[in-house]
C-alpha cells in the first residue's frame, strides 16, 4: 500500500499556504482527486509529489494515491482543508445528475472542519427541503440525498453557520432522471396493409414510455407526415398516438410507413408496407415440386401458399383420381395464417395406400375468382417378381415378370445346386437384361416389365434366378428344374405388405 507524507488523514491549512503531498510506493504511484486548479504534479519513479505554492479554498478535497501495478489495488488518501473565513464551501459541481432511487451526492466540501456542527441543506432562496427528504452530511464529501426522487429535482445550497450567521454556497442543480428502461415502446398497426384503389385505409402509430419526454412521428417513404397527436396517461405510462385515415387510397399512398419514437435512451422504429392494387388478386404457389413420388406406406404433407386480397371466401382439397372416388378427410387438412394476406394450407397424407396415388387439387376462391393448384402423387413400390417356364417358337424359355415403381432392372443368374437364392460362391453365369420389355406403364401405377431367358436344355442340378431391383428395393424368384417338370421358389420374404 502506498504511503502519503504527511502521514495524517486530514490536513488543515490557510489560504496562500504551500502544500506538498508526497506519495511513495514499491512501484510507480499516481495521484487522483478532484481535478482542481493550481496543483503541480511531479513524478519520479516510485514517488509522486502533488504540490501548490498558493492553496485556495478550491484545493479542499480528498486526494488519493494508488499503485497501478499493485494486484491488490491498495490506495492511501489524505483530505485537505483550505480554511478560508470568507469561503466555507468548495462546491465541486454545478449540477448533479442521478437516476431515481440512487443516492445523490451534492459535493459541497466544507473548507473548515470546525464548521461541521452548523451545516444544513436548503433549497435556493432559503426555501426548506421538501417533506420526506432524507439526507446526511460528510465534511469530506458533502450532502447526500438518499434514494432521490424525480420530484426532488431542484436547485440546492449548502449552508454553514459562521459567527452566528448562515453563509450559503453557490447553488447546485440536482437532476433526478426517471429510470427509463430504453426507447419508447412502439406499435404500428396493421403490420401489413393491402387495399384496392378507392378503398379506405387506416394506419395507427403509437408509442408509450414511463417518462413524458419522448417524441413520436409517422413517416411515409422517409417523409414525415403531419398528423395530429393524441396523448393519454394510463397504467403509469404516457401514450402518444398518431392515426392516419385515408378515405380513398390511390397508388401514391402505397409504400413504406415507419413509426419512429425517441427519448434520451435512444430511438425505436418499426415499419410496415402498404400495397395499393388495381383489383382483387388470388395467387397459389408451393415450395414443393408439383410432381411428388413417395414410397408406399410412407407419409406426405402437401403444402400450398395462398396470397390473396380480399380474404378467401372458400377453399378445399379435392382428390381427382384415378383410383377411387374417395375425398381427403377434412381432419387431415390444416390451414395456418402466416399474416393477414398470406396463408398456408396443408393436406396430410399418412401411411399412403396404393389407392391414394393420383392427383390432388387445392381450390380457393375470393372476389378475384377461382384458382387451383394440382399435385401429382406417384407411389414407389419395390419389385415383385415371378418366373415361369414356357416354349416360345419351339424354344424352351424362362419368362420373368417384374412389377414395381420406378421401373425395375432385371438380372438373371444361373447357379449350381438347388437353392432359394443364388449366393456368390454358387454363381455360374450372370446375364443383365438392359432392355426388358415393358408390359404396362400407366400413370400412378406400377410398371410391369418382362424378361426372357432362352435355355436350350435345363440343367437339373442347377437353379435359375430372376432378380429385379429399383430405388426402393429388390425382389427375386428362383426356378429349379426337376425331372418331372419344373419347380419354382419365390423367396420366403417375397410377399410385400404395405
Amino acid at each position: 500500500i502506498p504511503v502519503i507524507e504527511p502521514s495524517v488523514p486530514e490536513l488543515v491549512v490557510k489560504p496562500g499556504a504551500t502544500v506538498t503531498l508526497r506519495c511513495v510506493g514499491n512501484g510507480s504511484v499516481e495521484w487522483d482527486g478532484p481535478p482542481s486548479p493550481h496543483w503541480t504534479l511531479y513524478s519520479d519513479g516510485s514517488s509522486s509529489i502533488l504540490s501548490t505554492n498558493n492553496a485556495t479554498f478550491q484545493n479542499t478535497g480528498t486526494y488519493r494515491c494508488t499503485e497501478p501495478g499493485d494486484p491488490l489495488g491498495g490506495s492511501a488518501a489524505i483530505h485537505l482543508y483550505v480554511k478560508d473565513p470568507a469561503r466555507p464551501w468548495n462546491v465541486l459541481a454545478q449540477e448533479v445528475v442521478v437516476f431515481e432511487d440512487q443516492d445523490a451526492l451534492l459535493p459541497c466540501l466544507l473548507t473548515d472542519p470546525v464548521l461541521e456542527a452548523g451545516v444544513s441543506l436548503v433549497r435556493v432562496r432559503g426555501r426548506p427541503l421538501m417533506r420526506h427528504t432524507n439526507y446526511s452530511f460528510s465534511p469530506w464529501h458533502g450532502f447526500t440525498i438518499h434514494r432521490a426522487k424525480f420530484i426532488q429535482s431542484q436547485d440546492y445550497q449548502c449552508s454553514a453557520l459562521m459567527g452566528g450567521r448562515k453563509v450559503m454556497s453557490i447553488s447546485i442543480r440536482l437532476k433526478v432522471q426517471k429510470v427509463i428502461p430504453g426507447p419508447p415502446a412502439l406499435t404500428l398497426v396493421p403490420a401489413e396493409l393491402v387495399r384496392i384503389r378507392g378503398e379506405a385505409a387506416q394506419i395507427v402509430c403509437s408509442a408509450s414510455s414511463v417518462d413524458v419526454n419522448f417524441d413520436v412521428f409517422l413517416q411515409h417513404n422517409n417523409t414525415k407526415l403531419a398528423i395530429p397527436q393524441q396523448s393519454d396517461f394510463h397504467n403509469n405510462r404516457y401514450q402518444k398516438v398518431l392515426t392516419l385515415n385515408l378515405d380513398q387510397v390511390d397508388f401514391q399512398h402505397a409504400g413504406n410507413y415507419s413509426c419512429v419514437a425517441s427519448n434520451v435512451q435512444g430511438k425505436h422504429s418499426t415499419s410496415m408496407f402498404f400495397r395499393v392494387v388495381e383489383s382483387a388478386y388470388l395467387n397459389l404457389s408451393s415450395e414443393q415440386n408439383l410432381i411428388q413420388e413417395v414410397t408406399v406406406g410412407e407419409g406426405l404433407n402437401l403444402k400450398v401458399m395462398v396470397e390473396a386480397y380480399p380474404g378467401l371466401q372458400g377453399f378445399n382439397w379435392t382428390y381427382l383420381g384415378p383410383f377411387s372416388d374417395h375425398q381427403p378427410e377434412p381432419k387431415l387438412a390444416n390451414a395456418t395464417t402466416k399474416d393477414t394476406y398470406r396463408h398456408t394450407f396443408t393436406l396430410s397424407l399418412p401411411r399412403l395406400k396404393p389407392s391414394e396415388a393420383g392427383r390432388y387439387s387445392f381450390l380457393a376462391r375470393n372476389p378475384g375468382g377461382w384458382r387451383a393448384l394440382t399435385f401429382e402423387l406417384t407411389l414407389r413400390y419395390p419389385p415383385e417378381v415371378s418366373v415361369i417356364w414356357t416354349f416360345i417358337n419351339g424354344s424352351g424359355t424362362l419368362l420373368c415378370a417384374a412389377s414395381g415403381y420406378p421401373q425395375p432392372n432385371v438380372t438373371w443368374l444361373q447357379c449350381s445346386g438347388h437353392t432359394d437364392r443364388c449366393d456368390e460362391a454358387q454363381v455360374l453365369q450372370v446375364w443383365d437384361d438392359p432392355y426388358p420389355e415393358v408390359l404396362s406403364q400407366e400413370p400412378f401405377h406400377k410398371v410391369t416389365v418382362q424378361s426372357l431367358l432362352t435355355v436350350e436344355t435345363l440343367e437339373h442340378n442347377q437353379t435359375y434366378e430372376c432378380r429385379a431391383h429399383n430405388s426402393v428395393g429388390s425382389g427375386s424368384w428362383a426356378f429349379i428344374p426337376i425331372s418331372a417338370g419344373a419347380h419354382t421358389h419365390p423367396p420366403d420374404e417375397f410377399l410385400f405388405t404395405p
Partner: antibody, heavy 117, light 110 residues
Framework: QVQLQESGPGLVKPSETLSLTCTVS????????WSWIRQPAGKGLEWIGR???????NYNPSLKSRVTMSVDTSKNQFSLKLSSMTAADTAVYYC???????????WGQGTMVTVSS | QSVLTQPPSASGTPGQRVTISCSGS????????VNWYQQLPGTAPKLLIY???QRPSGVPDRFSGSKSGTSASLAISGLQSEDEADYFC???????????FGGGTKLTVL
C-alpha cells in the same frame, strides 16, 4: 488497459438533441472524472464538460444551457446530451478520462457527428 | 477563437530542434499547470506532457515542456518524420472553472 469507445448517431437534424455514450472497458469507471471534448473539422479542441462517477458535473459556460451529462456505473458508461443542435455543432466528439494534474490521459477514438437536415 | 494562443504552424528538418509556444493569462497558464497533446493525422489526441514538464511513460525524452509566467512551450529535439502532427496546449482556466485549449500548431517535417 483502460479503453474508451464513443457511440451514437453520425447524423443529427437541426434543433434535435444529440445523444452520445462512452463505454469504458479494461477498468472501472468509478472514482474518476470523465470529460467530453469536441473538434470541428480542421479546427482546435473544445472542452464540453466533465462528470464524476457520483453524477457531479461541470460544464463549459458557453454550452452549459444545452448540455446534460449522466453516468451509469453498472454499465461502465457515461453519456452526453447536447440539445438544440445547429450546423456549428458539427464535429468529432471525443470522450476522455480527466485526471488531477494530468488532464486527459486516455481518449476515445472519436465519433463524427454531422448536423444536417 | 481559442483562449490559449499558439502559432498555427511550425516546421523543421529531420534532426533539428523545434519549439512551439503557447501563451495565456494569469487566469490559466499563470496560475495552473500546462498539458500538451499530440494529434497524429486521423487519430485522437494523445497526452504528451502533463504538469508543465512531466512525460507519461512511453513518450520519448526528445519531447520536453516548460512554463514561465503566462507562457509555456513544447520543445522537440532530434525531429523525426513521425513527429509530423498537430500539437495542442491546454490548461485549467480559473474564472471559467474549466479546461481550455490552444488553437493547435501544425508541425511539418521538411
Amino acid at each position: 488497459q483502460v479503453q474508451l469507445q464513443e457511440s451514437g448517431p453520425g447524423l443529427v437534424k437541426p434543433s434535435e438533441t444529440l445523444s452520445l455514450t462512452c463505454t469504458v472497458s479494461g477498468g472501472s469507471i468509478s472514482s474518476y472524472y470523465w470529460s467530453w471534448i469536441r473538434q470541428p473539422a480542421g479546427k482546435g479542441l473544445e472542452w464540453i464538460g466533465r462528470i464524476y462517477t457520483s453524477g457531479s458535473t461541470n460544464y463549459n459556460p458557453s454550452l452549459k444551457s444545452r448540455v446534460t451529462m449522466s453516468v451509469d456505473t453498472s454499465k461502465n458508461q457515461f453519456s452526453l446530451k447536447l440539445s438544440s443542435m445547429t450546423a456549428a455543432d458539427t464535429a468529432v466528439y471525443y470522450c476522455a478520462r480527466d485526471r488531477l494534474g494530468r488532464a486527459f490521459d486516455i481518449w476515445g477514438q472519436g465519433t463524427m457527428v454531422t448536423v444536417s437536415s | 477563437q481559442s483562449v490559449l494562443t499558439q502559432p498555427p504552424s511550425a516546421s523543421g528538418t529531420p534532426g533539428q530542434r523545434v519549439t512551439i509556444s503557447c501563451s495565456g493569462s494569469s487566469s490559466n497558464i499563470g496560475s495552473n499547470t500546462v498539458n500538451w497533446y499530440q494529434q497524429l493525422p486521423g487519430t485522437a489526441p494523445k497526452l504528451l506532457i502533463y504538469s508543465n514538464n512531466q512525460r507519461p511513460s512511453g513518450v520519448p525524452d526528445r519531447f520536453s515542456g516548460s512554463k514561465s509566467g503566462t507562457s509555456a512551450s513544447l520543445a522537440i529535439s532530434g525531429l523525426q518524420s513521425e513527429d509530423e502532427a498537430d500539437y495542442f496546449c491546454a490548461a485549467w482556466h480559473d474564472s471559467l472553472n474549466g479546461r481550455v485549449f490552444g488553437g493547435g500548431t501544425k508541425l511539418t517535417v521538411l
